[in-house]
Interface confidence: low
């Protein structure tokens, strides 16, 4: 077969248009000027190139920009972004939120790929912090994004950004992450009145300390059992039966169904049985009447 290197007569690309989809890979390589491609990248996404053809286009851009693509090209990569490796992306300097959105749109509906994770990392590091607009964008595309960050990374989230967080964004967060996010949320929502405050803070309560739970119990918040079950066990244990009853309001009846699960199980073991009996729920496992309760944490502190 003839060596396929020279561009056939009359096939030199004058612009990036739909005629190129009929070019074989070797023709694209031979007939498309890399600089022309770079200046007309916005057209590529509208043309149904095969994945093999996209490989050729990527190769041409790699040759033109060995140190990494400029943002003017990155913003218009479209489906070509799916061809990039994390190593390619580490060379980029992405500063525009519009560029980030354009590339996230390409990956929409798919799980976060290593490429996307690298892109986000480059973008956030470039900005210095997870500002509200960025967080808004990232959680819109990846509801679980926030919970994929380490506590250290979450510490760069400014309290103002917490307004962008939706309850579902925190579904997969573990207690260590909520420990970091809760104080920020408390600060962000501090000027709201009681009932509005509780609605906003509810998703973050897995990071709340005992004192804050005690304070909430005085505000008729009627916490649901699902939220209660996500509270830190060490924050729930010191609560009295009366405080839990006020915290849960009408939902207190749900404790019976959860009496074998943490944190309810551990909390029951710390309560006097006659205090539990006042709830009328038949909760069992409390400290029998007449037994002395020792606060072991206090004992350890003294020794």
């Amino acid at each position: 077969e003839v060596e396929k290197t020279a561009c056939p007569s009359g096939k030199k690309a004058r612009e990036i248009d739909e005629s190129l989809i009929f070019y074989k890979k070797w023709e694209l390589e031979a007939c498309v000027d890399a600089a022309l491609l770079a200046t007309q990248m916005d057209r590529v996404n509208a043309i149904p190139f095969t994945y093999e053809q996209l490989d050729v286009l990527k190769h041409k851009l790699d040759e033109l920009y060995p140190q990494g693509y400029p943002e003017s090209v990155i913003q218009h990569l479209g489906y070509l972004f799916l061809k990039m490796s994390p190593e390619d992306i580490r060379k980029w300097n992405v500063t525009s939120l519009e560029t980030l959105k354009a590339l996230l749109e390409v990956n929409k509906g798919h799980e976060m790929s290593p490429q996307v994770a690298t892109l986000i990392d480059r973008f956030v590091k470039g900005r210095g912090q997870l500002d509200k607009d960025t967080l808004d964008t990232l959680t819109a595309f990846y509801p679980g994004y926030l919970c994929s960050l380490s506590p250290e990374e979450l510490s760069s989230v400014p309290p103002s950004s917490i307004w962008a967080v939706r309850p579902q964004d925190l579904d997969t967060c573990d207690p260590r992450q909520l420990d970091v996010l809760y104080p920020k949320a408390r600060l962000a929502f501090q000027n709201m009145n009681g009932s509005e405050y509780f609605v906003k803070i509810q998703s973050f309560l897995g990071g709340a300390p005992t004192e804050d739970l005690k304070a909430l119990s005085q505000q008729n918040v009627s916490m649901d059992l699902a939220t209660f079950m996500k509270l830190r066990t060490d924050a729930v244990l010191p609560l009295t039966v009366a405080e839990v009853q006020k915290l849960l309001g009408p939902h207190v009846e749900g404790l019976k169904a959860e009496e074998r699960h943490r944190p309810v199980r551990d909390w029951i073991l710390r309560q006097r049985q006659d205090d539990l009996d006042t709830l009328g729920l038949g909760l069992q496992g409390g400290i029998p009447n007449g037994y002395l309760v020792l606060d072991l944490s206090m004992q350890e502190a003294l020794s």
């Epitope: 074989k24 149904p48 190139f49």
Partner: antibody, heavy 122, light 106 residues
Framework: EVQLVQSGAEVKKPGASVKVSCKAS????????VHWVRQAPGQGLEWMGI????????TYAQKFQGRVTMTRDTSTSTVYMELSSLRSEDTAVYYC???????????????WGQGTLVTVSS | SYELTQPPSVSVSPGQTASITCSGD??????ASWYQQKPGQSPVLVIY???RRPSGIPERFSGSNSGNTATLTISGTQAMDEADYYC?????????FGTGTKVTVL
């Protein structure tokens, strides 16, 4: 699964025109190119032309230039093929075929309509 | 105008290999596709881009394309493979179909 549903059989007189429609059940139909191909009784497949996703660009086989018009109504996900100045040799089954493809493969027709029989007879 | 030529018919015994050729000027420089058509049915794409199989097409169908000839190979041919087969390529703004080959499973 995406299906292309074509309009019913037609009987036309020589010199008349026929307009065949092709409607997709999938909601992403407007993203793809659509071909029209015909097959005379007992004969092979013959390509007639192609229309792009937005409907603004068409390419017709030289044999049908001036007689065929392909249009697209993106609001109803329907593509139309109109053939004028009919003659008896235009009697054929007319197929629409979509370029859906794996990996943006443009070069083949991978979703086909059930075909519309057009009979031209005096 | 560009032409693709196929043998009118190919006969094969069940379980054997059937090869259908498609000839055209410098066909290897173009992408070849293959379609299967059973009586009274619409064509079905079995090979695209020379040698790629769409999902749902059995592995016994394979393709190659070089020089002036594209070939569709059916390994371990089954009775259900009896049909007309058409090659197709693109040339200068035109899609061209081959003349068609009737495959008979004896």
């Amino acid at each position: 699964e995406v299906q292309l549903v074509q309009s019913g059989a037609e009987v036309k007189k020589p010199g008349a025109s026929v307009k065949v429609s092709c409607k997709a059940s999938g909601d992403t139909f407007n993203r793809y190119y659509v071909h029209w191909v015909r097959q005379a009784p007992g004969q092979g497949l013959e390509w007639m032309g192609i229309i792009n996703p937005s409907g603004v660009s068409t390419t017709y086989a030289q044999k049908f230039q001036g007689r065929v018009t392909m249009t697209r109504d993106t609001s109803t996900s329907t593509v139309y093929m109109e053939l004028s100045s009919l003659r008896s040799e235009d009697t054929a089954v007319y197929y629409c075929a979509e370029v859906r493809g794996s990996g943006y493969n443009y070069f083949a027709m991978d979703v086909w309509g059930q075909g519309t029989l057009v009979t031209v007879s005096s | 105008s560009y032409e693709l030529t196929q043998p009118p018919s190919v006969s094969v015994s069940p379980g054997q290999t059937a090869s259908i050729t498609c000839s055209g000027d410098k066909l290897g420089d173009k992408y070849a596709s293959w379609y299967q058509q059973k009586p009274g049915q619409s064509p079905v794409l079995v090979i695209y881009q020379d040698n790629r199989r769409p999902s749902g097409i059995p592995e016994r169908f394979s393709g190659s394309n070089s020089g002036n000839t594209a070939t569709l190979t059916i390994s371990g041919t089954q009775a259900m493979d009896e049909a007309d087969y058409y090659c197709q390529a693109w040339d200068s703004d035109t899609y061209v179909f081959g003349t068609g080959t009737k495959v008979t499973v004896l």
